[in-house]
């Protein structure tokens, strides 16, 4: 049988332990003589035959610490978690997501207010009563916003005439407010009267492409958190209501836009500022801030395009799209069935990555089938647990500096999983000849470090 | 491996003028000397009464380093009418595109607007000027009686250029028809000889133009970004362009033939909104004496062991076949959010191995986003996956990022010792770098055995 | 049902008024613009006056510029033409129509395209 | 103003026969010209929007096509509620202007 520990001539003990999970060295003074130093280096049952002590084997255990104490989450636990892992060796540890019963919820109806949409807005004025009627079955404390979103002021996507550029509908059956990037009409309130009043003051406006600025809108209500008024212990739902697809980041290089996005908050009296100066955010870059920010997102999509907002939900996590009727009869139904949705979809994603140390995990569903942790569970009830099976591995020792803990997220909660990770890549006595001296560390005293006093 | 990073040449323009976001080289047949063309779109210009109408400036690449603008339009805004202006060309991107091809030089303003004759308007068809030795013409094909956003009204022609091997131009304008987007092609010669400053459309007799299709294609930006290559052997360059929202913004790569402008064919990205099509190049990597196609799609999402998606960028290799069609390859990018494949210049045959060689750009990779420049190089199965140098951007960010790599231009050997050199902008910090490649020294060693 | 009902016409002399209403109902009447048009006996029609949802634009035919005002009261759902100074080539059957919300190809809807039609009422000037 | 002119002015049909009345503006129009066909002591009624859009409700045999400057509708089998007289009208730009007609009649 191949014994990669003894065949591979490591010369020191840091390299002997790079060699597999199954290497050990031995730092038993006696325990060569005239041999070769690779000789140290062997699985340690075979040290041990060959007569190492086994308190002089360095061997570095992987260790899994769970500190039970000051547990402060209730849905993800445990919220922190300590592993001790070695080259090529992995660590294993359950994570449980434990849904609530009943959630506070902040739902912000972002809405798509150029002129194609000026069939679907009328419906706004009857959203709020109904809806927090509707929604009061499934959350203990339901709170409404609002804003508004048609694209970047600039050409080529409005008319830059002076006569329309304030009033894209001059000259047309519509009369419109002047266009803008996003404007943050209401924050998240309880009064369903002052939402259904700024919803009822809600004019049209209007541009000349179809694709809307809806990605710039969706990702400054995401990040403005103070702004917006999201609570940190609310469900977040963020309601896109448009007909028309989104401008991608590179789209605004037409108007000579081309900077990128840089994620940040960018509200001036409640209106966008950036809207002309940075470009719209990528997906990838809307994925992470929504997801960073707790956001679920509900696509309420009038028309064809439904279908382009249905496509891109595999690459958003934890949104969803629902498919609005003429005249948007059907929007607060849809809100409520998104929610359900939502609230029944468990799946996690590490986060802050660290170099060098890999996730693997798997979900166990409710049901007893098992998925892959981003796939995760869905139609899962408030009484369910989701148990996530995290399988941490460190290939090899070549990474120095960088994060030293990575963090799993359930998307869409707010709690999150913090696991510090911390490489065993070096030897408790290492190789130096040097003249002896007093160990510092008490704990490793004469026994093992044969260079100590 | 070959490009000298320790002593590159340096040019700068005016802060805040976008000095670098286009670039090229410009070697004039009767002049011994050689020169950078660097495009400075928002730069202010001495044209009476136009705010940033952006310039073109030539830099000596040899002695001074200097950089002087090239005078391609001292004019302001033409009348139709008193008070009423014809065209306006403050902030209209001048020098946002540029290529050269011999004595001749292409620039162009994709955000040049006028008024229309036919009513009032204020619409973005763009405009461009061509230079040949000594004369200097406006080409503004987009400029037309097809008005209005389902004509040409909102065309931008000039978005991106090119030139072919037998003098004719080629012009992307994204906007056309709903912004379906369009190509157009006309000889060089008779954009010179036709203009007349008095016309403001004026018809080509050559000229060679996709046309509008059903409105399911709007949206699509065919124009976006174009290259020419010979893709069925006829010998005449045909033309590539970009079309990174079409097929629902899973982006499209469309070649047409360069004798007629019918369609040859037709690659699809495989991930929506990645932009596909952001960047496109030919050149024959592989040594068989077919162009290949290169493509970007600088937002592509690349899904990690974890199972999450990280934004990496992509750009697609495909090998034209001798039968005719293509075997595609793809390359991933290293870095999160770096946009690899926003540029892609050939390079020519870099270290003389026989294979030509390719820069792919990550404007937004390496240390503090300063930008980041990989090398491949070609061999007889494609290109080597591994870059076999990195450019690093050593300009940190002002008041957006660097943007190192953002364009590109090779194949050019301006210093004349047989290797060709690279030119990089950044137009973030308004500079752009001419990396010259230094000679591949071949050691050969022997060793003799004479037994006694 | 969509239904518009114009009412005002009859004879008048040259130089003379008329106040022409046309009643809508069936649609939400602020959110549509709302035209006139005319036809002359036995002639083809002429647009004449349209005004915009809120009553905040309004546009003539330079043949009664001047002359006619376009109004509406969206609180009685109800268009008015005041016509002054009027004319005999001023004879003709009026019809309020509903300007129609058609998509376009872009964001903005197609301009000046009727799509419900009242079934008129006759103007003659004559002395 | 832009001219719209239309021909024939008139024309006679059969029931089953296949209809064509043509529409010409006096500048390019792109394809914003719409279709409406009036019977006597009628209202106007819409058929077709932006060139080749059918309007709702309207029976599959009407058609248009054209852009620029030449229009066309087609009644691809006539029937008899289809004797009326048809108008064109440009909706491209203030003011909007209309044909003189093509009345269609009873052969």
């Known amino acids: 049988e191949d014994n990669r520990c003894a065949s591979s001539n490591a010369a020191s003990c840091a390299r002997c332990l790079a060699l597999g999970p199954e290497c050990g060295w031995c730092v038993q003074e006696d325990f060569i003589s005239g041999g070769s130093r690779s000789e140290r280096c062997d699985i340690v049952s075979n040290l041990i035959s060959k007569g190492c002590s086994v308190d002089s084997i360095e061997y570095p255990s992987v260790h899994v610490i769970i500190p039970t104490e000051n547990e402060i989450n209730t849905q993800v636990t445990p919220g922190e978690v300590s592993i001790q892992l070695r080259p090529g060796a992995e660590a294993n540890f359950m994570l449980k997501v434990h849904p609530l019963k009943k959630y506070p919820v902040d739902l912000y109806y972002l809405v798509d207010v150029s002129a194609s949409m000026h069939n679907n807005i009328e419906k706004l004025n009857s959203v709020g009563n109904d809806l927090s009627r509707k929604m009061a079955f499934f959350s203990r404390d339901f709170r409404l916003g609002f804003g508004s979103y048609v694209d970047k002021t600039v050409s080529p996507y409005i008319s830059i005439h002076p006569e329309r550029i304030h009033n894209q509908c001059s000259d047309y059956n519509l009369d419109c407010m002047p266009p803008h990037g996003y404007i943050h009409v209401l924050s998240l309130t309880e009064n369903i009267t002052e939402f259904e009043k700024a919803v009822h003051r809600q004019k049209i406006s209007g541009n000349i492409d179809t694709p809307e600025g809806g990605f710039d809108a969706m990702l400054q209500a995401a990040v403005c958190e103070s702004h917006i008024g999201w609570r940190k212990e609310a469900k977040r739902l963020l309601l896109v209501m448009t007909d028309q697809t989104s401008h991608l980041a590179l789209d605004s290089k037409l108007a000579g836009i081309v900077v990128p996005n840089d994620g940040n908050c960018h509200l001036k009296n409640n209106v966008y500022v950036k809207s002309t100066t940075m470009e719209h955010p990528s997906l990838g870059q809307l994925s992470e801030k929504l997801i960073d920010n707790n956001i679920n997102v509900i696509f309420a999509v009038q028309g064809k395009q439904f279908h382009w907002y249905k496509d891109l939900l595999p690459l958003l996590p934890g949104t969803i799209a629902g498919e609005i009727e003429s005249k948007a009869a059907n929007l607060n139904n849809l809100v409520v069935e998104a929610y359900q949705k939502l609230i029944s979809e468990v799946k996690v994603q590490v986060e802050n990555q660290v170099q060098g140390i890999y996730f693997n995990i798997t979900a166990i569903c409710p049901d007893g089938s098992r998925k892959p942790g981003m796939e995760g569970c869905r139609n899962v009830t408030s009484n369910d647990e989701v148990l996530f099976n995290v399988t941490v591995t460190m290939k090899k020792c070549d990474v120095t500096g960088g994060k030293n803990y990575a963090i799993i997220k359930p998307i869409g909660f707010n709690e999150t999983a913090k696991i510090h990770i911390h490489r065993n890549c070096s030897c408790q006595c290492e190789d130096n000849r040097g003249p002896k001296g007093k160990c510092v560390d008490e704990t490793f005293l004469d026994s093992k470090c044969f260079q100590c006093d | 491996f070959n490009l000298d990073v320790d002593s590159p040449a340096e040019y700068s323009g005016p802060e805040g003028s976008y000095f670098g976001f286009a670039v090229d080289f410009f070697v004039p047949s009767a002049s011994s000397r050689m020169f950078l063309l660097v495009g400075a779109p928002k730069a202010n210009t001495t044209q009476p009464g136009i705010v940033e109408g952006g310039q073109v400036l030539k830099c000596d690449w040899s002695s001074t380093r200097r950089c002087q603008p090239i005078e391609f339009d001292a004019t302001g805004n033409r009348d139709y009418a008193k008070d009423d202006p014809l065209e306006f060309k403050s902030h209209q991107w001048f020098g946002a595109s540029v290529r050269s091809k011999q004595d001749k030089i292409l620039a162009c303003a994709p955000l040049y607007h006028w008024r229309t004759e036919m009513k009032q308007e204020r619409e973005p068809v763009g405009t461009c000027f061509l230079q040949d030795g000594t004369k200097t013409v406006e080409y503004a094909p987009c400029r037309s009686q097809d008005i209005d956003a389902d004509g040409q009204g909102f065309c931008q022609g000039g978005f991106s250029i090119d030139f072919t091997k037998a003098d004719r131009v080629l012009l992307g304008g994204p906007g056309s028809f709903y912004w379906q987007g369009q190509l157009i092609s006309d000889q060089v010669a008779e954009i010179v000889s036709k203009y007349d400053p008095n016309v403001y459309s004026i018809k080509y007799n050559n000229q060679l133009a996709t046309r509008t299709a059903q409105a399911i294609f709007d949206d699509s930006y065919l124009g976006y970004s174009v290259a020419v290559g010979d893709f069925n052997g006829d010998g005449i360059d045909d033309f590539v362009s970009g079309v990174p929202r079409a097929a629902r913004t899973l982006g499209m790569v469309y070649i047409y033939d360069g004798k007629n402008m019918s369609s040859l064919y037709n690659f699809t990205g495989e991930q929506m909104a990645a932009y596909f099509g952001f960047s496109v190049a030919a050149t024959d990597i592989n040594g068989d004496d077919y162009a290949d196609v290169f493509i970007g799609a600088p937002l592509f999402m690349d899904r990690g062991s974890d199972g999450k998606l990280q934004e990496v960028g992509q750009v697609s290799v495909s090998l034209q076949r001798a039968s005719g069609d293509f075997q595609t390859t793809k390359l991933n990018g290293f870095e999160v959010f770096a946009r690899f494949g926003s540029a892609i210049a050939p390079l020519g045959d870099l270290d003389q191995d026989g294979f030509n060689d390719i820069a792919i750009a990550a404007p937004y990779g390496g240390e503090d986003k300063k930008g980041i420049v990989y090398i491949f190089n070609g061999r007889s199965t494609g290109l080597n996956a591994v870059p076999s140098q990195i450019l690093e951007g050593q300009w940190a960010a002002r008041s957006m990022p660097p943007s190192f790599g953002y364009s590109m231009k090779g194949a050019t050997d301006i210093d004349k010792n047989g290797y060709p050199d690279l030119i990089v902008g950044a137009f973030g910090v308004d500079r752009a770098i001419l990396y010259r490649a230094r000679p591949v020294i071949t050691v050969n060693a022997g060793l003799e055995v004479y037994p006694s | 049902e969509v239904q518009l009902v114009e009412s005002g016409g009859g004879l008048v002399q040259p130089g003379g008024s008329l106040r022409l209403s046309c009643a809508a109902s069936?649609?939400?009447?602020?959110?549509?613009?709302m035209s006139w048009v005319r036809q002359a006996p036995g002639k083809g029609l002429e647009w004449v006056s349209a005004?915009?949802?809120?009553?905040?634009?309004?546009y003539y035919a330079d043949s009664v510029k001047g002359r006619f005002t376009i109004s509406r009261d969206n609180s009685k759902n109800t268009l008015y033409l005041q016509m002054n100074s009027l004319r005999a080539e001023d004879t003709a059957v009026y019809y309020c129509?509903?300007?129609?919300?058609?998509?376009?190809?872009?964001?903005?809807?197609?301009?000046?395209?009727?799509?419900?039609w009242g079934q008129g009422t006759l103007v003659t000037v004559s002395s | 103003d832009i001219q719209m002119t239309q021909s024939p002015s008139s024309l006679s049909a059969s029931v089953g026969d296949r209809v064509t009345i043509t529409c010409r503006a006096s500048?390019?129009?792109?394809?914003?010209l719409a279709w409406y066909q009036q019977k006597p002591g009628k209202a106007p009624k819409l058929l077709i929007y932006?060139?080749?859009s059918l309007q709702s409700g309207v029976p599959s045999r009407f058609s248009g096509s054209g852009s620029g400057t030449d229009f066309t509708l087609t009644i691809s089998s006539l029937q008899p509620e289809d004797f009326a007289t048809y108008y064109c009208?440009?909706?491209?730009?203030?003011?909007?202007?209309f044909g003189q007609g093509t009345k269609v009649e009873i052969k």
């Open positions: 129509a509903r300007s129609a919300l058609l998509p376009s190809r872009g964001d903005l809807p197609l301009r000046w395209v009727s799509d419900y």
């Open positions: 005004i915009s949802g809120s009553g905040g634009s309004t």
């Open positions: 932006a060139a080749s």
């Open positions: 500048q390019g129009i792109s394809s914003y």
């Open positions: 009208q440009q909706h491209y730009t203030t003011p909007p202007t």
């Open positions: 069936g649609f939400t009447f602020s959110s549509y613009a």
